[in-house]
Amino acid sequence: DVNEAPQFSQHVFQAKVSEDVAIGTKVGNVTAKDPEGLDISYSLRGDTRGWLKIDHVTGEIFSVAPLDREAGSPYRVQVVATEVGGSSLSSVSEFHLILMDVNDNPPRLAKDYTGLFFCHPLSAPGSLIFEATDDDQHLFRGPHFTFSLGSGSLQNDWEVSKINGTHARLSTRHTEFEEREYVVLIRINDGGRPPLEGIVSLPVTFCSCVEGSCFRPAGHKHHHHHH
């Protein structure tokens, strides 16, 4: 009669939790049985992020630190079931913690928008397109940002209009701009739960142009036109 190792009740174990669960929350559990009826002790292996602890007797798994989906999901650890007494045989399975995103990253510009310019003087109102993003996971649909000017005083000179969920157009309301840099503040709302807002700045230069590029004295780079 050969002593056999414990047998887990499932091939693997998974649990879905919100990434903002309180420390000490039960996030899942594992179960195994020993063919000889011996008691089983559970342990975790490979908890590299130090997020979890397991009850050695019940197999319940608890969070012991803040969880962060952006660190990678699912988070995978090994669970070990070991006979208590006997030959101390053990079996290994896996516990996968699936972290469901909470909206915890404010919107931001998708790339560096330095170097935006219009040739001065404007012959007609101009516009440029910009893109927003954030670091949250958007299950089943892309981000749906809304855009507005960041302060009321900007509304005399600029307007912002949404193109789609990630892109918007910034347009001048007139042609009477000075030959200088304007910093346009844009408010981006992600419409999440809870909604998060980012205020970003788009620096736009009105400058004299040579062959379609901003003229700069020696030592300054030419900027590229964006409208």
């Epitope: 499932q10 091939h11 693997v12 998974q14 879905k16 490979g46 079996s91 290994v92 996968h96 699936i98």
Partner: antibody, heavy 116, light 107 residues
């Protein structure tokens, strides 16, 4: 990036054995179980079993238990699946796949043809 | 063994259509379910796991729902590259089993 590269196509006679290899790269080989599936012409996918490369623990589908052997060579990050006593109905494309929740990376498949 | 029954076995649809494929397990698999896309001559590609969670790099037009024994894969707006065979698979306990597949064809 993660890659699973399998050995080339094989033609075998009934009663013979075939050994298919699957070389892993781009991740920690011992950290993920490796499964084998097969798909016969006009049929669905069929799970054959898996190996845990860190412990060499294997578990096989009862259907293949007496004929299949899975092994792992940590020094080359390669797993092997050997199927013996081949018959014509073993003609199929054989796949290795890395296990996560489901199979997140698959080999390109190895066609094994059993014909007299 | 847990049987996975997929329906329909084949489906004709047009680009832009919304498509739904269902998968029924012979017993409760508690959302231990994955969906795959398989194109001729290629390896299967993981679309969703845990019934509802999109795998890395999978477009958001794919979504999954369900619990217990009944599960659904939905493609909200079919794209030309979505025409392929789709499989469900449970990983609740061994032996792991697949549905027989749904062939999605251009109408």
């Amino acid at each position: 990036q993660v890659q699973l590269v399998q050995s080339g196509a094989e033609v075998k006679k009934p009663g013979a054995s075939v050994k298919v290899s699957c070389k892993a790269s781009g991740y920690s080989f011992s950290s993920y179980w490796m499964h084998w599936m097969r798909q016969a012409p006009g049929q669905g996918q069929e799970w054959m079993g898996y190996i845990n490369p860190s412990t060499d623990y294997t578990e096989y589908n009862q259907k293949f238990k007496d004929r299949v052997t899975m092994t792992a060579d940590k020094s080359t990050s390669t797993v092997y699946m050997e199927l013996s006593s081949l018959r014509s109905e073993d003609t199929a494309v054989y796949y290795c796949a890395r296990s996560r929740l489901g199979f997140d990376y698959w080999g390109q498949g190895t066609l094994v043809t059993v014909s007299s | 063994d847990i049987q996975m029954t997929q329906s329909p076995s084949s489906l004709s649809a047009s680009v832009g259509d919304r498509v739904t494929i269902t998968c029924r397990a012979s017993e409760n698999i508690d959302s231990y379910l994955a969906w795959y896309q398989h194109k001729e001559g290629k390896s299967p590609k993981l679309l969703l796991y845990a019934a509802t969670v999109l795998a890395d790099g999978v477009p958001s037009r794919f979504s999954g729902s369900g619990s217990g024994t009944d599960y659904t894969l939905t493609i909200s707006s079919l794209q030309p590259e979505d025409f392929a065979r789709y499989y469900c698979q449970h990983y609740y306990r061994t032996p792991l089993t697949f549905g027989q597949g749904t062939k999605l064809e251009i109408k």
